[in-house]
């Protein structure tokens, strides 16, 4: 348990700490418009926000990183907000033989933590 | 393959991009000195450095995040440097009945990527 306990309440105020946020993006934004057919508009959940001391720590390494950042901020970066899990997305691809269904297991974030 | 290819050469110059770095820390630094007996000094490998566009992208999500950060930098953060794998560490713990060996699978980073 590392005797350091992650916390879930944001000390910076609502919406400031690491959380999931939906960003709309078109296939043009992604540079995918010539080979993905549909959907043309994607709801991309992403992890945004700060990772203050012990907030949503991913694991022991993150807890330690937070502690050492407090001691050596120039040497050790603060933990940062990254996906903890993903939601699969199915896109229709243009292929030489027509159209295929392609699953992306790691495109849209489902949960976030501080790593 | 997402038609965006992660790259491994750092465009910012040597040592500036996401990489593994060893940080020395004492049990006192970690706040563990009353319950971990040995070792008293730890070599903690951590992930530090920047994640410029497409550098060491962890997965499709990270590639997309890098792309959208370029388009909407205020809305979408750049990917950040986090562990991709860990190396187990064994510590000697003080327990009620004496001393025990405890393995930490997620304490010391072994590799880094941009997520």
């Amino acid at each position: 348990s590392a005797h350091l306990h992650p916390r879930d309440s944001c000390p910076l105020g609502p919406g400031r700490c690491c959380h999931l946020e939906t960003v709309q993006a078109t296939l043009e934004d992604l540079g995918w418009s010539d080979w993905v057919l549909s959907p043309r508009q994607l709801q991309l959940s992403m992890c945004v926000g700060e990772c203050p001391h012990l907030y949503r720590s991913a694991n022991t390494h993150a807890l330690i990183k937070a502690r050492l950042h407090g001691l050596q901020p120039d040497r050790v970066p603060a933990p940062c907000c990254v996906p903890s899990s993903y939601t699969p997305v199915v896109l229709m691809h243009r292929t030489d033989s027509g159209v295929s269904l392609q699953t992306y297991d790691d495109l849209v974030a489902q949960g976030c933590h501080c790593a | 393959s997402a038609h965006l290819h992660p790259r491994d050469s750092c465009p910012l110059g040597p040592g500036r991009c996401c990489h593994l770095e060893t940080v020395q820390a004492t049990l006192e630094d970690l706040g563990w000195s009353d319950w971990v007996l040995s070792p008293r000094q730890l070599q903690l490998s951590m992930c530090v450095g920047e994640c410029p566009h497409l550098y060491r992208s962890a997965n499709t999500h990270a590639l997309i995040k890098a792309r959208l950060h370029g388009l909407q930098p205020d809305r979408v953060p750049a990917p950040c440097c986090v562990p991709s794998s860990y190396t187990p560490v064994v510590l000697m713990h003080r327990t009620d009945s004496g001393v025990s060996l405890q393995t930490y699978d997620d304490l010391v980073a072994q590799g880094c990527h941009c997520a």
């Epitope: 057919l37 549909s38 959907p39 043309r40 709801q43 939601t87 699969p88 159209v99 269904l101 | -």
Partner: antibody
């Protein structure tokens, strides 16, 4: 909100053709594709094919290949499904369904009953 | 094509009881599976996608599990409005295919 409104019931003779329409609203029509699914009376659901409203690319169920044509009219945000050489076993409720990035779809038309009878 | 087999064909359950519906794929569909509920005269309603993610507005008593070839839809405590036909659907490969359905009826 997303709505798919289909044309009314049709009665056709064997050998004839039917064209069912599906008018979309509540979203940008060209951003998503349309699936067509049918259901014979008292039976299960059968997937017929898919069309992307943006480019008109299609993918049809093999058993219907040559008899089915799916089209879209982007000016009216309407998708069409035409089935030719109708047989009695084509009697079914035909549904249009908007695709989503998650595979399953909550967006279904109300259904159009096509009866094939001599 | 991938054949989806649902069992049982009919399930008789009392209100308040748990219902467990099964869906088997003839080959792996990963987690690319959805569950729909259909009542007479209505279009199907999406309950679950991605094998286990509840669609917007779907009550917590509905849950999905499984991956690969074996999937389960569980209704933890049947309400009167839950008596209907349930279909599974795979969208891992063309052609998209549905199971034959399970009718959940009042015991």
């Amino acid at each position: 909100q997303v709505q798919l409104v289909q044309s009314g019931a049709e009665v056709k003779k064997p050998g004839a053709s039917v064209k069912v329409s599906c008018k979309a609203s509540g979203y940008t029509f060209t951003d998503y594709g349309i699936f067509w699914v049918r259901q014979a009376p008292g039976q299960g659901l059968e997937w017929m094919g898919w069309i992307t409203a943006y480019s008109g690319d299609t993918h049809y169920a093999q058993k219907l290949q040559g008899r089915v044509t799916m089209t879209t009219d982007t000016s009216t945000s309407t998708a069409y499904m035409e089935l030719r050489s109708l047989r009695s076993d084509d009697t079914a409720v035909y549904y249009c369904v908007r695709d989503t990035q998650y595979g399953g779809s909550p967006y279904w038309g109300q259904g159009t009953l096509v009866t094939v009878s001599s | 094509e991938i054949v989806m087999t649902q069992s049982p064909a009919t399930l008789s359950v009392s209100p308040g009881e748990r219902a467990t519906l099964s869906c088997r794929a003839s080959q792996s569909v990963s987690s690319n599976l959805a569950w729909y509920q259909q009542k007479p005269g209505q279009a199907p309603r999406l309950l679950i996608y991605g094998a286990s993610t509840r669609a917007t507005g779907i009550p917590a008593r509905f849950s999905g599990s499984g991956s690969g070839t074996e999937f389960t839809l569980t209704i933890s405590s049947l309400q009167s409005e839950d008596f209907a036909v349930y279909y599974c659907q795979q969208y891992n490969n063309w052609p998209i295919t549905f199971g034959g359905g399970t009718k959940v009826e009042i015991k």
